[in-house]
Every structure is written in structure tokens, then in C-alpha cells.
Amino acid sequence: IWELKKDVYVVELDWYPDAPGEMVVLTCDTPEEDGITWTLDQSSEVLGSGKTLTIQVKEFGDAGQYTCHKGGEVLSHSLLLLHKKEDGIWSTDILKDQKEPKNKTFLRCEAKNYSGRFTCWWLTTISTDLTFSVKSSRGSSDPQGVTCGAATLSAERVRGDNKEYEYSVECQEDSACPAAEESLPIEVMVDAVHKLKYENYTSSFFIRDIIKPDPPKNLQLKPLKNSRQVEVSWEYPDTWSTPHSYFSLTFCVQVQGKSKREKKDRVFTDKTSATVICRKNASISVRAQDRYYSSSWSEWASVPCS
Amino acid sequence: RNLPVATPDPGMFPCLHHSQNLLRAVSNMLQKARQTLEFYPCTSEEIDHEDITKDKTSTVEACLPLELTKNESCLNSRETSFITNGSCLASRKTSFMMALCLSSIYEDLKMYQVEFKTMNAKLLMDPKRQIFLDQNMLAVIDELMQALNFNSETVPQKSSLEEPDFYKTKIKLCILLHAFRIRAVTIDRVMSYLNAS
């Protein structure tokens, strides 16, 4: 058993049928010695008396808010949560496996630049009685500071019969140098509590590996005289690291017809313009990627050919 | 990524082309190592990220773009001093800091070159003959060093008398390649920045 926060405790259980569970001793936070009784949740049934209460915690029915009283007055509370270990592996019931970029990916994180700011998100089908708490650091043995905000519900989607909820959090490394060569990964730890179930999820990454630039901005077409060709131009996104001559991007320009089956013409360039043939009803899209370290491509910025 | 490669203008900063080749070569070598050594811990998540140039050179700090010198987090100690006379310094704009930067890059390349050559000698003794260093990568390191053209004492190639542990050597190869790729990215950024300025 360990303390998650004041008066909230996590009991770690080897989770299998007929498991013996864990013996837990609760102590009433009071100078009183006599006349103390214990109850669980809203029940008035007295579980025991005395300054300490010894319980055998086996299942969720044994978890909850234990309260010690004296003469009708509440003295203190202890909330017991359960953390299930199933055959040597901590349970992952609360969050959905996003399966991208690989199986058992519960937290996904992205950064728009090298400033040390990043966003993480996760999915669940649970809509109520759910709380998250996020901590982060650079390295784990001698951790350096990363400050995270509160996790917020950022999207709701319908997936078949189920509703899916997306939560996200923004974090910022306290003293980040955009040009630094990372040797220690960022660690992100999310505590999730659903009713009386506790779970924790972690992700470890280098900022360089989660970079995904914003799409190029100010995408414009300029027709070339006496030609079906157009000059496409764009600019670096505002959120990208500066100077751009140091943090350079490379671009992919795509001409896509109305039909998804039509052949796509693609050009790769390091410049912020390109000359392409604009077909009728086609659209031109441009996306960006770090020129020197191949992390994710940005989403496409698009304009119609007409 | 197999993308069309632009050839640099003749007037371009002479080292840019070499640094682009270096990044391409080390990235290819790392990809080859990860595929060949699939049963070894060779991915970024599995290896320890060591930097053989730590406390010996200070490339990131010496080559910091002017725009980032206002960022206190970027200004670690710059204690290392280097010899300055290099042929990449083709323009009158060359400052002491630029010379320091380029000579730090040269020192990095020299250190990695020695490590890679020593390691290749060990790998050639492996009866499994599983993996060797790409000669193209070694040649590209050499070309960039020549383009930088700094006078510096030659570091003797390390020779070891004990029987090599090939498992450890292959893991060290992965560690070195990951670190060198990160340094090659920094070198490419620096060359691109110097070329633009």
C-alpha cells in the first residue's frame, strides 16, 4: 500500500480468483483513543472499533472510503483504491490501446517544434467518475523539470456503438535549448482513477522523435504565362523553431485529382516554392518535415487548382 | 527517404554538400545495423545514449546560432578551445566563433573516425561476419574532415590485445551510430545556417 495523495491510498493486488489479497491496517488520524468506530462509504454498518482497523482487501467491494467516527462526529477518512496486477502485468482497463505507432501505445505525444513544449493525449470509453493527473521529467534517475498543465477533455467521438473520449495535456520543459542534442528521454506519467480503480501509464521519448510541424502557411498559386504550369509558394509555419536556416524543413508537394484513384504527382523540395502542372478539378497540397531528422510529416495544407 | 537530391551551387559554402552526404551515409548505416542486428538491443528506446565527445568538444555550444545565444538554457560552459585555420572558412565574415565551431566539428569527426576504425577491425575478426562498417560512411567522414582542413594531432588507432567480445562490440556499434547520427544532424544544421549567413 502507498499514498497517492493526502488520505488516498493505493493497494496493489495480485489479481486472480480466490487470491488472498492484502492485509491493510488503517489508523484514525486523531488524538482520541477510545470510542472510535469505522464505516465504509455510505453504509452505517460498523466494521470495527478502535484507533486502528485491520482489513483484508481482496476485491473492489473492500475498497472505498473508510471513515472513523466518535459520537457521531467524523474524525478522518482514508480512501482505498485498487491497482490490479494481472499475471505480473499492471492492468490497463481505463485507457484504450491506440496501436499507433505500435501495440500497447496508450499515450501519444507530439511537439510542433524544438522549444521543449509538447502535447500528449489518450483515449477512453469511460465518461464518468474519471480523474487524471500528469507528471513529467527529463530523465528518471536524476530528473530535470518539466511542467504539465491539467488534463482536459479535448474531443468526443462516436465509434460504432461506443462513445470515445480524448483527453490531452500540455507540458513544457523548464529549461530547454532548441539546439540541444537530447541524451535523456522525456518521461511522462499519467495516473488514472476510475471509481475505485487506479492505473498508471507511462511514455518515454525524445522531443526529436515526436516532432510534427504545423502545415505550411500562406499556400498560394501563381499561374505561369502560356502554360498549364503554376508556381506554388508557401511559408514556414509560425510555430516552427527559428532560425529557419538552422531548423530547416523539407517539403512534399502533391497534385491530387478529384478522384482518390487518380495518380498523385509528388515533388520533394527544400525550397518554399515549386512549379507543378495544375489539372482541372485538382488540388495542390504541401506538407513539411524536419529536413535533417525524419520524424512525422505535418498535415497537408491545400488549395484548389481553379 | 529516397528523395531527389539537389546538387549544391559551386559558390555554396564548401562543407554543406559533404555534411549532407555524411548524414545520408550515417542514417543508411544505422538503418542497416538495426536490420542486421534485429536480435540485439539496437533501437533508440533500447540503447544507452552515450556521447564519446562529451567533455572533449562542445559543438552544440560553439555552433549555436546567434538567435539562440539569448536563450540561457543554450549557454552551457564553453571551456574548450580549438586550433583555428580551416579551408571551409572561405568568406571574410569568418569570426573567431565560427572557427571554433568548425574546429569542434573537425574534432568530433576525428574522434568518431578513430572509434569506427577500431570497431571495424574487431568486427572483421567476428567468425559470424554479421556486420561491417560501410566504407562509404568512413570515406564521407574523411572527405568532410579534408574540407574542414584543420591541423590537428593524429589520434592513434586504439588497438586491444584481449579477445574481442563481439556481442558487446555490436551493441557499442549501435550506441555509436545513434550518437553519430544525432551529431551529423547538428553538423548539417550548422552548415545550412553558415551557408545562409
Epitope: Y16, E86, D87, G88 | -
Partner: antibody, heavy 115, light 112 residues
């Protein structure tokens, strides 16, 4: 004490269907994940499928994906394996089993796919 | 499709020490714990070892398990006639959990 009693095995022709059941008692069935494991005659153990405690997630071996469906009825304390498009290579003893560091196995039920 | 490799058979005389190996990889045994089962003819498997080296109550102490790197082993010190059975190791792969990964199985024969 924990008990898993299996039923539903038998002889079936290729291409036909069969449903296996596993009745649980002696524990809170709705709190634990469950597996199906099979063993072809004279061969080793092969995992078939898993279902979460609440039925929210199901996992299958590639060899049965799209043909077998694992399900559970927590109100009846029963686990099921619906097997469709049966093939000769599905002939085996099928076991249900609890998920956890200490596990309990059913007695096994024989499924024979033969024309 | 077995990822965990065991020797097909091992044998020993009563009282001898018999060991069975189970060889896997970084993503299974290297990452997760190992279990060992004993299966007597015509019966369901019985758990002998869980968590690499833990014995459930009721399992004789002549059975012991260990794990090192990407391999595990089961030792029977002072093998007895009633130990003649098939033995299976089991683990999980970090990418496909909760799918059970079983070893190929080892037939233990107790001679004469």
C-alpha cells in the same frame, strides 16, 4: 472453491459451427479476464482467445480470427466460444482458463472436425 | 508459430536433477514473467511455477524456476516417477499481450 465446468464439444463436419460453454463458480466471475486454449491430439498448447472481465476487449489468435467469437454473460457466470467455418485443423481439446498469476483450468472438451 | 523453444524431450533416473530450458526473445521472456505447467496424460495443465521462480502452495519444492535474459529454465531436483509428464513454459509478448505464448513442450521421461 474455484470451478470451471465445460460443455458443448462433439463431432462436427467441416464448415459447420459449434458453441462451447464454460460455467464458472466459486469466485466473482465478472471481475476476471478469461482465455480459451486448445491442444490438438499429440500436440502442444495453443492459445485461442481472450476476453476482458467486462467483455469490452477481445483478442484472437491469427489462426481463428474471423471464424471464432469469444463472449461472456456475467449474469450467468458463463464464458462462450462460438466456432464457425470449422476446419479439420481445429480438431483439439479446448480448455477455458482464468487470467492471472495463479490460474484455474476447465476439464477440457473435445472438438472433432471430420467429414 | 511457437516463439518459445523447448527441447522435445529430457530424461533422468529417479533422484537425478533434470532441467528444461525455454528460449525466447527480448519482447517476451526478456520483458515479461514466465510460468511453467505440468500436464499428465488426459488432464488439464497444472501450474508449477509463476512469476519466473514462485511456487504455488501444494507444489513440491523439488520444482524450481529461474530466468536469465531471454531464457528461462525449470529444474526438478530429485526427479520422481510421478514427474513423468509434458512440461510447458508460458509467457507474453509485450506487443500482443494478453495473448498467451506457450513453449513447444518437453516430454520428461523417468528411466527405470
Amino acid at each position: 472453491q474455484v470451478q470451471l465446468v465445460q460443455s458443448g464439444g462433439g463431432v462436427v463436419q467441416p464448415g459447420r459451427s459449434l458453441r462451447l460453454s464454460c460455467a464458472a463458480s466459486g469466485f466473482t466471475f465478472s471481475s476476471y479476464g478469461m482465455h480459451w486454449v486448445r491442444q490438438a491430439p499429440g500436440k502442444g498448447l495453443e492459445w485461442v482467445a481472450f476476453i476482458r472481465y467486462d467483455g469490452s476487449n477481445k483478442y484472437y489468435a491469427d489462426s481463428v480470427k474471423g471464424r471464432f467469437t469469444i463472449s461472456r454473460d456475467n449474469s450467468k457466470n458463463t464464458l462462450y466460444l462460438q466456432m464457425k467455418s470449422l476446419r479439420a485443423e481445429d480438431t483439439a481439446v479446448y480448455y477455458c482458463k482464468t487470467h492471472g498469476s495463479h490460474d484455474n483450468w476447465g476439464q477440457g472438451t473435445m472438438v472433432t472436425v471430420s467429414s | 508459430s511457437y516463439v518459445l523453444t523447448q527441447p522435445p524431450s529430457v530424461s533422468g533416473t529417479p533422484g537425478q536433477r533434470v532441467t528444461i530450458s525455454c528460449s525466447g526473445g527480448r519482447s517476451n521472456i526478456g520483458y515479461n514473467t514466465v510460468k511453467w505447467y505440468q500436464q499428465l496424460p488426459g488432464t488439464a495443465p497444472k501450474l508449477l511455477i509463476y512469476g519466473n521462480d514462485q511456487r504455488p502452495s501444494g507444489v513440491p519444492d523439488r520444482f524450481s524456476g529461474s530466468k536469465s535474459g531471454t531464457s528461462a529454465s525449470l529444474a526438478i531436483t530429485g526427479v520422481q516417477a510421478e514427474d513423468e509428464a509434458d512440461y510447458y513454459c508460458q509467457s507474453y509478448d509485450r506487443g500482443t499481450h494478453p495473448a498467451l505464448l506457450f513453449g513447444t513442450g518437453t516430454k520428461v521421461t523417468v528411466l527405470g
